[in-house]
C-alpha cells in the first residue's frame, strides 16, 4: 500500500477510519459498516452509538467519528456526551420521582430543568424586598430599610468637592 511504514509501530500508519490487521502484516482495513475509528493506529473499530428512543441524532456517525446524540423535544441532556435524557418541567416546577411538581412556597425555578431553589433572603444583606418572589422568579432585593427613611436618597451621594488650588493626585 502507498504509505510510509513507521519503524516503531507499523499500525501507526493506519489512519482514522481504518483498523490495523495484525494478522496480515499490518494492513489497514476499512472500518466495517456502522463502526468507526477516530484516531490512527487502532486495532479495532468501535461500534457507532445509536441515538434511539428519547435520544435523537445530532451528528451522524462516520467511519472516523462517533455519532452524537441530543434529546427529543420535552427532554434535555444530562451527563458527559448526553449519556442520559431527563424530562423537562415548566418554569416554577422541579422533577421528582413522581413527575413534575410545583415549587414549594419560598422557592423558585426559572428553568425547565434543575431543582427549585430558595428565594434570596434580602435581610441577610441588610436589604429589603423590592419585588416579591414567585415560583418562577427570585425576589428582587432593594435598598436597606434605613436608606428609605424620609429625606434619604437611594442615589449614591456625590463625592466631596476638592479644595480650590489642588489638582488631582
Amino acid at each position: 500500500f502507498e504509505r510510509t511504514r513507521s519503524l516503531q509501530d507499523p499500525c501507526s500508519n493506519c489512519p482514522a477510519g481504518t483498523f490495523c490487521d495484525n494478522n496480515r502484516n499490518q494492513i489497514c482495513s476499512p472500518c466495517p459498516p456502522n463502526s468507526f475509528s477516530s484516531a490512527g493506529g487502532q486495532r479495532t473499530c468501535d461500534i457507532c452509538r445509536q441515538c434511539k428512543g428519547v435520544f435523537r441524532t445530532r451528528k451522524e456517525c462516520s467511519s472516523t467519528s462517533n455519532a452524537e446524540c441530543d434529546c427529543t423535544p420535552g427532554f434535555h441532556c444530562l451527563g458527559a456526551g448526553c449519556s442520559m435524557c431527563e424530562q423537562d418541567c415548566k418554569q416554577g416546577q422541579e422533577l421528582t420521582k413522581k413527575g413534575c411538581k410545583d415549587c414549594c412556597f419560598g422557592t423558585f425555578n426559572d428553568q425547565k430543568r434543575g431543582i427549585c431553589r430558595p428565594w434570596t433572603n434580602c435581610s441577610l444583606d441588610g436589604k429589603s424586598v423590592l419585588v416579591n418572589g414567585t415560583k418562577e422568579r427570585d425576589v428582587v432585593c432593594g435598598p436597606s430599610p434605613a436608606d428609605l427613611s424620609p429625606g434619604a436618597s437611594s442615589v449614591t451621594p456625590p463625592a466631596p468637592a476638592r479644595e480650590p488650588g489642588h489638582s488631582p493626585q
Epitope: 502507498e2 496480515r24 489497514c28 472516523t64
Partner: antibody
Framework: QVQLVESGGDVVQPGRSLRLSCTAS????????MHWVRQAPGKGLEWVTF????????YYADSVKGRFTISRDNSKNTLYLQMNSLRAEDTAIFYC???????WGQGTLVTVSS | DIQMTQSPSSLSASVGDRVTITCRAS??????LNWYQQKPGKAPKLLIY???SLQSGVPSRFSGSGSGTDFTLTISSLQPEDFATYYC??????????FGQGTRLEIK
C-alpha cells in the same frame, strides 16, 4: 440525502487512459474513506481500490496495481480514478461507494475496445 | 485473500415463499459479513451488516445469521420486489474486499 454520482465513463481503445469522477453530497465527504468497485457485463462485483478519508492511505486490487490511481479532493467533495494502460478486461460499470459500502453511485460504464 | 462462496448460484421461488441463501468463507471471519441486493441496471444496496444487523430502511422480512465461516440470508416471505441478485461480502480481512459470486433469485 446521501448521493454519489459517477461520471467520465466512455469507449476507449486498449492502452489509452481515462479519468472517472465521483461527486458526493448529503454527507460529510471528508470524514469517509471511499472505494471504487466494478462489475463486468453480466458478472459479479469486483473491488478495485480504496482511499482513506484524508487521502493518506490507498490500496489496490492486484488486477489494477500500477495502472490505476485513486485520489480525492475534499474541498470539491470529489473522488477520482485515473485509469492508464486500459485493457479489454477493464470493461465494466464502475461504482464509487462510501467506505462502509452502505451507499453506492449509479455507476459509469467504461468500455475498452479496439 | 479470503474467498467467499455462495450457494445456490441461482434459485426459483414464488411470492410468499421463505428463501435461504448461504455464504461460506474460506476462513473464519467472525461476524464481519454483509449482504447486498442488486437489481438489473442498479447499484448494489446494503441489506445486512455484521452478519445479522438490518440496515436502516430495509424491510424486516430480511434477516441474517451465522458467524465464523457459515452465514445465511433469509427472506421470510418473498415479495415481487425481492427478485434480484444477492451478494455476500466479508469485511474482516480487507483489503481486498471480497464478494461472493452472487445468487440470482428468479420468479418460479
Amino acid at each position: 440525502q446521501v448521493q454519489l454520482v459517477e461520471s467520465g465513463g466512455d469507449v476507449v481503445q486498449p492502452g489509452r487512459s481515462l479519468r472517472l469522477s465521483c461527486t458526493a453530497s448529503g454527507f460529510t465527504f471528508s470524514s469517509f474513506g471511499m472505494h471504487w468497485v466494478r462489475q463486468a457485463p453480466g458478472k459479479g462485483l469486483e473491488w478495485v481500490t480504496f482511499l482513506s478519508y484524508d487521502g493518506s492511505y490507498k490500496y489496490y486490487a492486484d488486477s489494477v496495481k500500477g495502472r490505476f490511481t485513486i485520489s480525492r479532493d475534499n474541498s470539491k467533495n470529489t473522488l477520482y480514478l485515473q485509469m492508464n494502460s486500459l485493457r479489454a478486461e477493464d470493461t465494466a460499470i464502475f461504482y464509487c461507494a462510501r467506505d462502509w459500502l452502505d451507499y453506492w453511485g449509479q455507476g459509469t460504464l467504461v468500455t475498452v475496445s479496439s | 485473500d479470503i474467498q467467499m462462496t455462495q450457494s445456490p448460484s441461482s434459485l426459483s421461488a414464488s411470492v410468499g415463499d421463505r428463501v435461504t441463501i448461504t455464504c461460506r468463507a474460506s476462513q473464519s471471519i467472525s461476524s464481519y459479513l454483509n449482504w447486498y441486493q442488486q437489481k438489473p441496471g442498479k447499484a448494489p444496496k446494503l441489506l445486512i451488516y455484521a452478519a445479522s444487523s438490518l440496515q436502516s430502511g430495509v424491510p424486516s422480512r430480511f434477516s441474517g445469521s451465522g458467524s465464523g465461516t457459515d452465514f445465511t440470508l433469509t427472506i421470510s416471505s418473498l415479495q415481487p420486489e425481492d427478485f434480484a441478485t444477492y451478494y455476500c461480502q466479508q469485511s474482516y480481512s480487507t483489503p481486498p474486499i471480497t464478494f461472493g459470486q452472487g445468487t440470482r433469485l428468479e420468479i418460479k
